[in-house]
């Protein structure tokens, strides 16, 4: 015989769940023991069966889970899974916060990405700081020339996707350019999107020829300027 224990504690590390109103929330407390334990759920210390909740709840005992769809502010609280058998019991608390802020288009920090000048062979980092209520997705684009033109017949620029990423809110997204050459020079765009819309800002990368060390030593006062 064995008291209940968590089988996947790493899946329970996210204690605070802050989700936008209307989203689905799933709490899991995967456990085992001998005899096989049962699971009960409490909300703010009281037995929770979801009977007073519009839309109810889904309890999937074989998955040790509680699912609530279309959460509303009244769903806020502490949710406790109580796992017990004849030998003992264990419990774990989840905190649910339902966010009511109006989700908006991603906001990009002014001045990022920044115009940058680099020397051939050097490494470059372009930064993009995104603020978004909904989880944003990011694309780094390079504006390219096709048949001698930067724009198509529709007036829109030709772009090439360099990198795509899904990031958490308020993270800094970085585009790394290693060992840059003259071909890397040009306009780069950080495009951020979420369920509400897209926002994007651009910067120029200027790539200078490799400095001749003898020329630099002989004429230290001569320097490239923007």
């Amino acid at each position: 015989q064995q008291a209940p224990y968590w089988t996947h504690p790493q899946r329970m590390e996210k204690k605070l769940h802050a989700v936008p109103a209307g989203n689905t929330v799933k709490f899991r407390c995967p456990a085992a023991g001998n005899p096989t334990p049962t699971i009960r759920w409490l909300k703010d210390g009281q037995a929770f069966h979801g009977e007073n909740r519009i839309g109810g709840i889904r309890l999937r005992h074989q998955h040790w889970s509680l699912v609530m769809e279309s959460v509303v502010p009244s769903d806020r609280g502490t949710y406790t899974c109580l796992v017990e058998n004849a030998v003992g019991s264990i419990r774990y608390n989840y905190l649910l916060d339902v966010l009511e802020r109006s989700p908006h288009r991603p906001i990009l920090q002014a001045g990022l990405p920044a115009n940058t000048t680099a020397v051939v062979g050097s490494d470059v980092e372009l930064l993009c700081k995104v603020y978004s209520d909904a989880q944003p997705h990011i694309q780094w684009l390079k504006h390219i020339v096709i048949n001698g033109s930067s724009f198509g017949a529709d007036g829109f620029p030709y772009v090439q996707v360099l990198k795509t990423a899904d990031i958490n809110s308020s993270e800094v997204e970085v585009l790394y350019l290693r060992n840059v050459s003259a071909e890397d020079a040009g306009e780069y765009t950080c495009l951020a999107g979420n369920s509400i819309g897209l926002s994007y800002q651009s910067a120029w990368l200027t790539v200078l020829p490799e400095e001749d060390p003898t020329w630099t030593a002989a004429a230290p006062e001569a320097r490239y300027t923007d």
Partner: antibody, heavy 124, light 112 residues
Framework: EVQLLESGGGVVQPGRSLRLSCAAS????????MHWVRQAPGKGLEWVAV????????YYADSVKGRFTISRDNSKNTLSLQMNSLRVEDTAIYYC?????????????????WGQGTMVTVSS | DIVMTQTPLSLSVTPGQPASISCTSS???????????VYWYVQKSGQPPQLLIY???NRFSGVPDRFSGSGSRTDFTLKISRVEAEDVGVYYC?????????FGGGTKVEIK
């Protein structure tokens, strides 16, 4: 041709449920957020809900929060709206609308393509 | 929520004459990326809305150049330089900067 086609409307009693569907074609459905907008008879337009391209984010108008659920099946190019606890004031034409895509916006980033709409009448 | 207020409620125009519709938002629609997220639609009888203008002043593909959008921050205008019979319908402005997305109450354009 880019198209959105709604279905599932009908007459239903207050308190009952209805499920609307929207079939998308002519574009990469899984790359776009999708919205529902409704219009009560003789009235203006009211935004109802949005779902992100992968279904991970959903937002609702206060008037339907807790009663309506937006969902999508990218494998079937289908958007759905599950409407529970229907009220007389939910009577409207429901439009499926394409939202923002994931790539560079060659034109508007959404709200450019609308379906023909499906009529929902809630009446006792 | 952002409130969109449209004027006038209705408009009766002689063909070939100009028409102007105003829309005011309760908050600025100028976003950090420099764009102003106001859209204009026309809804003809028995049809879904059709996009005319996006991001304040950009004409959607296929929209005649007699339609133009202008304004800044909270005050917006849709102009039809020479109204034609096919322009009858209800015109709506919409803010597309945050949820809930909101529409103006509509302006009904009729031909004299």
């Amino acid at each position: 041709e880019v198209q959105l086609l709604e279905s599932g409307g009908g007459v239903v009693q207050p308190g009952r449920s209805l499920r609307l569907s929207c079939a998308a074609s002519g574009f990469t459905f899984s790359s776009y957020a999708m919205h529902w907008v409704r219009q009560a008879p003789g009235k203006g337009l009211e935004w109802v809900a949005v779902i992100s391209y992968d279904g991970s984010n959903k937002y609702y108008a206060d008037s339907v929060k807790g009663r309506f659920t937006i969902s999508r099946d990218n494998s079937k190019n289908t958007l759905s709206l599950q409407m529970n606890s229907l009220r007389v004031e939910d009577t409207a034409i429901y439009y499926c609308v394409r939202g923002a895509g994931r790539g560079f916006p060659y034109g508007p980033d959404g709200f450019d393509i609308w379906g023909q709409g499906t009529m929902v009448t809630v009446s006792s | 929520d952002i409130v969109m207020t449209q004027t006038p409620l209705s408009l009766s125009v002689t063909p070939g004459q100009p028409a102007s519709i105003s829309c005011t938002s309760s908050r600025s629609l100028l976003h950090s990326d420099g764009k102003t997220y106001v859209y204009w639609y026309v809804q003809k009888s028995g049809q879904p809305p059709q996009l005319l203008i996006y991001e304040l002043s950009n004409r959607f593909s296929g929209v005649p150049d007699r339609f133009s959008g202008s304004g800044s921050r909270t005050d917006f205008t849709l102009k039809i330089s020479r109204v034609e019979a096919e322009d009858v319908g209800v015109y709506y402005c919409m803010q597309y900067i945050e949820a809930p997305l909101t529409f103006g109450g509509g302006t009904k354009v009729e031909i004299k």
